[in-house]
Every structure is written in structure tokens, then in C-alpha cells.
Interface confidence: low
């Protein structure tokens, strides 16, 4: 995981795979790490536009395609501090990226397994 430099307020955006470069069909995990208490609501922004997702500190992008490429950041909203935006990270989808082990495979038992 890469820890992007965070502002003094302590919000960091972690990206896996390292460098944000992933092969088509791979999975990207973005984690918004905030030191605030209580944990604030976290929303996500892609290329400057809010993503229509429920608040969550973890953004999972499974089976990525080129439409998932872009610049991502997270915004943490705390009632007493207002919104804080993380440094952005760039996600690139390329054949030379890290596809990682297969996830969500279904074995002979019929049970889905975590890779």
C-alpha cells in the first residue's frame, strides 16, 4: 500500500495495488484513513465529481476497466470540523498493471472464497 502524503489534519488516502496501476479485471482498493474522533462520514470523488455511493471509508473497485481510470480523492465530513479532502491518487488501467490473485472464486464446494 502506498501512503500518499497527508495534510496536517491527518487524512490520508491509501491505494492498493501499489502505485494505482492495475490490469483490466483487477481490483483496486482505496482506503481513506482519518485520525478524527468520532470517525467522520467519508464520500468519494472521481475526476472532481462526487461518486453516488453510500458513505464508506473503503472504496473497492472490482473488475476494473478503462472507465475506472481517473483521479480519486476522499472527503471526510465531521460535524465539528467540516469537510476535509485527501490528496488525490491516480488510477491507471493497463495490461502491465498488477492484476493480483483472483478474488471471489468459487470452488468445487460451491462456496465463494476469498483469494
Amino acid at each position: 500500500r502506498v501512503r500518499e502524503p497527508g495534510p496536517p489534519e491527518g487524512i490520508q488516502l491509501l491505494v492498493e495495488p501499489e502505485g494505482g496501476i492495475v490490469a483490466p479485471g483487477g481490483t483496486v482498493t482505496l482506503t481513506c484513513a482519518i485520525s478524527a474522533q468520532p470517525p467522520p462520514q467519508v464520500h468519494w470523488i472521481k475526476d472532481g465529481a462526487p461518486l453516488p455511493l453510500a458513505p464508506s471509508p473503503v472504496l473497492l473497485l472490482p473488475e476494473v476497466g478503462h472507465e475506472d481510470e481517473g483521479t480519486y480523492s476522499c472527503v471526510a465530513t465531521h460535524p465539528s470540523h467540516g469537510p476535509q479532502e485527501s490528496p488525490p491518487v491516480s488510477i491507471r488501467v493497463t495490461e502491465t498493471g498488477d492484476e493480483g490473485p483472483a478474488e471471489g472464486s468459487v470452488g468445487e464446494s460451491g462456496l465463494g472464497t476469498l483469494a
Epitope: E16, T27, T29, L60, P62, P101, L114
Partner: nanobody, 116 residues
Framework: QVQLVQSGGGLVQAGGSLRLSCAAS????????MGWYRQAPGKQREWVTT???????DYAASVKGRFTISRDTAKNAVYLQMNNLKPEDTARYYC??????????WGQGTQVTVSS
């Protein structure tokens, strides 16, 4: 119909430990993450921790260093080891399984009460 069966809650004194378990009762495909959430009386449900398909874990700041998430891939099970429990950890704990292309599964919840 798949159900998530939770166990392991209960009453514990501050500073004590509990281990929560959550297992799928049927066939579950396309899992890409598992996690735990909690809801205290009169409050919104809040995220606690997540483990992704590649084993990446993350924790809410309030539990980091005290709680540990783990999984058993063969059983489609996820666990939450809770140490050094505090009264503010009192809540109903829910497990969640995220599936690629499907709505997530939620457990029925298990009560954890930490007395001072």
C-alpha cells in the same frame, strides 16, 4: 437463501476480550470483501473494519490496535477479535459480505455489552 450466522457476543468487563464469528450458511459467490459494523443505541450504524479479498485490512481509528479482523476462506467466515474492550464499544455488531455485482449480505447482529 444465504444467511450470515453470527455468534460470540455477550457481556464482558472493561479491559476484557471477546471474539465474534460470522459464517455464510449457503453458497456465496463473487466475494470481494468482508467486514464488521456496529450500532450503539440511538446512534447510526458505523463501520468498524474491513478485510478485502487480497487480505488488506483497515480499521476505524477508535478500534485500531485493539480489534483484529481475520477470515477463513474455506468456510466463508470472518472473525473479529476484540481486546481491551471499553464501555464505548457497547453496541450491536453486524458482519457484512460484499459481492461483486450483487447486493451485500448482512448478518443478523450480535450484542456486545462492556460494563465498567
Amino acid at each position: 437463501q444465504v444467511q450470515l450466522v453470527q455468534s460470540g457476543g455477550g457481556l464482558v468487563q472493561a479491559g476484557g476480550s471477546l471474539r465474534l464469528s460470522c459464517a455464510a450458511s449457503g453458497s456465496v459467490s463473487s466475494i470481494y470483501a468482508m467486514g464488521w459494523y456496529r450500532q450503539a443505541p440511538g446512534k447510526q450504524r458505523e463501520w468498524v473494519t474491513t478485510i478485502t479479498g487480497r487480505g488488506i485490512t483497515d480499521y476505524a481509528a477508535s478500534v485500531k490496535g485493539r480489534f483484529t479482523i481475520s477470515r477463513d476462506t474455506a468456510k466463508n467466515a470472518v472473525y473479529l477479535q476484540m481486546n481491551n474492550l471499553k464501555p464505548e464499544d457497547t453496541a450491536r455488531y453486524y458482519c457484512k459480505i460484499d459481492r461483486r455485482g450483487y447486493a451485500p449480505y448482512w448478518g443478523q447482529g450480535t450484542q456486545v455489552t462492556v460494563s465498567s
